[in-house]
């Protein structure tokens, strides 16, 4: 059996390249796991405008990942 299953990734597209910083309520990072073989960056938008996936290869995502990792470690 494959160790990773793509089927339960949260994002079903490649993700947007950027989100306006002023629109961001919260950013969450989901690291590769048994459910999903890739890193996912989830942006929660202000004013109940839902959530968006940020392309983890984008410049903005890399900055967010760096920021979160600095805070956590």
């Amino acid at each position: 059996f494959p160790m990773f299953k793509r089927g339960r990734c949260l994002c079903i597209g490649p993700g947007v390249k950027a989100v306006k910083v002023a629109d961001i309520e919260k950013a969450s990072i989901m690291y590769p796991s048994n459910n999903c073989d890739k890193i996912e960056v989830i942006i929660t938008l202000k004013e109940n405008k839902g959530q968006r996936c940020l392309n983890p290869k984008s410049k903005q995502a890399r900055l967010i990942i760096k920021k979160v990792e600095r805070k956590n470690f």
Epitope: C11, I12, G13, I42, G50, Q51, N55
Partner: nanobody, 126 residues
Framework: EVQLVESGGGLVQPGGSLRLSCAAS????????IGWFRQAPGKEREGVSC????????YYADSVKGRFTISRDNAKNTVYLQVNSLKPEDTAVYYC???????????????????WGQGTQVTVSS
């Protein structure tokens, strides 16, 4: 910027079928999640189906499961919605929409989509 154009709507009797098309210009649909939505007079726009850009997985609203089928032809830059066993309550303007940053749990939410077509009318009546 992607422009979307829907076609294939029309007047059909209950139990009939249609194939709706969503064609893109100004960009490729390969990277986009494509959703189909509908809006009946005086009602909210609701998501009926969408198809993932990454693995082709499909999602359907409970009201259309088993009757509607979404598919994509990236070579033709087109997404189709085959609608079968139509009921009068399926009468609406049908829109296709494209989005990149779509989460599974928000797959049928209009908030997830950035680009919209003008819509095609589907009327189910005897």
């Amino acid at each position: 910027e992607v422009q979307l154009v829907e076609s294939g709507g029309g007047l059909v009797q209950p139990g009939g079928s249609l194939r709706l098309s969503c064609a893109a210009s100004g960009g490729t649909l390969d990277d986009y999640v494509i959703g189909w939505f509908r809006q009946a007079p005086g009602k909210e726009r609701e998501g009926v189906s969408c198809i993932s850009s990454t693995d082709g997985s499909t999602y359907y609203a409970d009201s259309v499961k088993g009757r509607f089928t979404i598919s994509r032809d990236n070579a033709k830059n087109t997404v189709y919605l085959q609608v079968n066993s139509l009921k009068p309550e399926d009468t609406a303007v049908y829109y296709c929409a494209a989005g990149m940053g779509v989460l599974r749990q928000w797959a049928l939410s209009k908030l997830s989509y950035d680009y919209w077509g003008q819509g095609t009318q589907v009327t189910v009546s005897s």
